[in-house]
């Protein structure tokens, strides 16, 4: 008799999830000498242990602690780049500017980037059919809890000047409900972090507005200031030129406003 399976509103676990995580771990530890000591089989076992046989709406940060411990990594705390709703540009930037890091440049972020996963209560099966949607089903699902956990730890580790890339094309440039707005902002440590600097990325080619004056940016400034952290903001008017100048900063056109 086929067993009844809960139908969730979100997409199911990414196909070949175990193989993907293991392969990514091996690749990352080969590229990053400081993580060569990591045993990728143990990493996968800890990852699996966080959600397998557990109800996918009842996952806690505690479930991920064994994985967090194995994936402990020191990144330069003053070279952290956060982002919200503009992941691709942030990643393109750190691929060129190799001494700055997004969460996805760390082992744990790299392992899980763009993947979905969940299990089922009381069975060792991975659910490839559907997984809980954060809004429609539950917030304490395996993927959301993972990102909340690693994002909190990443923000807690930051020091000095922290940068965040924000999407100036969105109606809410700063969104309190994003991971950045709900987790990272509140976990920056005022005793370590001097300034949060926002880079607002413009979308339109002829958009010369000062998006640092946007009401949602003012809201971000207010939240940050109340936490005794200074705030500054910079418009990136031409993201294409910005990236080009990161690649070729000796070009004479790169000393003007980007």
């Amino acid at each position: 008799v086929p067993r009844w399976r809960q139908q969730w509103s979100g997409p199911g676990t990414t196909k070949r999830f175990p193989e993907t995580v293991l392969a990514r771990c091996v690749k990352y530890t080969e590229i990053h000498p400081e993580m060569r000591h990591v045993d990728c089989q143990s990493v996968w076992d800890a990852f699996k242990g966080a959600f397998i046989s557990k109800h996918p709406c009842n996952i806690t940060e505690e479930d991920y602690q064994p994985l967090m411990k194995l994936g402990t990594q020191t990144v330069p705390c003053n070279k952290i780049l956060l982002w919200s709703r503009i992941k691709d540009l942030a990643h393109q930037f750190t691929q060129v500017q190799r001494d700055m890091f997004t969460l996805e440049d760390t082992l744990l972020g790299y392992l899980a980037d763009d993947l979905t996963w969940c299990g089922e209560f009381n069975t060792s099966k991975i659910n490839y059919q559907s997984c809980p949607d954060w809004r429609k089903d539950c917030s304490n699902n395996p993927v959301s809890v993972f990102w909340k956990t690693v994002s909190r730890r990443f923000a807690e580790a930051a020091c000095d000047v922290v940068h965040v890339m924000l999407n100036g094309s969105r109606s809410k440039i700063f969104d309190k409900n994003s991971t950045f707005g709900s987790v990272e902002v509140h976990n920056l440590q005022p005793e370590k972090v001097q300034t949060l600097e926002a880079w607002v990325i413009h979308g339109g080619r002829e958009d010369s507005r000062d998006l640092c004056q946007d009401p949602t940016i003012k809201e971000l400034e207010s939240i940050i200031s109340k936490r005794n952290i200074q705030f500054s903001c910079k418009n990136i008017y031409r993201p294409d030129k910005f990236l080009q100048c990161v690649k070729n900063p000796e070009d004479s056109s790169c000393t003007s406003e980007i």
Partner: nanobody
Framework: QVQLVESGGGLVQAGGSLRLSCAAS????????MGWYRQAPGKQRELVAA???????NYGDSVKGRFTISRDNAKNTVYLQMNSLKPEDTAVYYC?????????WGQGTQVTVSS
């Protein structure tokens, strides 16, 4: 913040040489490019030479073959060796540090070439 301290400017005769230095200090991430620009009275600031961390260089047309830019990444310092100087090289020479989207400028050092 970031400070740029230039040195090595002065008065030199046409055909002579000078070596400019610029040291960067302060909160530096990764100095993507350091370089030299110059501004003569009544003219716009123009590129003299720039060099990326990796060593890619870019020279202004009027100095190619005469000026050489180099850098010491460990010391966050850039150098400009100026040979076969001409009176038209007379200008204030500004050190530049470019970490997009940040651009920093030094205070400038005067180079005067007499004929």
């Amino acid at each position: 913040q970031v400070q740029l301290v230039e040195s090595g400017g002065g008065l030199v005769q046409a055909g002579g040489s000078l070596r400019l230095s610029c040291a960067a200090s302060g909160r530096i991430f990764s100095i993507n490019a350091m370089g030299w620009y110059r501004q003569a009275p009544g003219k716009q600031r123009e590129l003299v030479a720039a060099i990326s961390t990796a060593g890619s260089t870019n020279y202004g047309d009027s100095v190619k073959g005469r000026f050489t830019i180099s850098r010491d990444n460990a010391k966050n310092t850039v150098y400009l060796q100026m040979n076969s100087l001409k009176p038209e090289d007379t200008a204030v020479y500004y050190c530049n540090l470019n970490f997009p989207p940040y651009v920093y400028w030094g205070q400038g050092t005067q180079v005067t070439v007499s004929s």
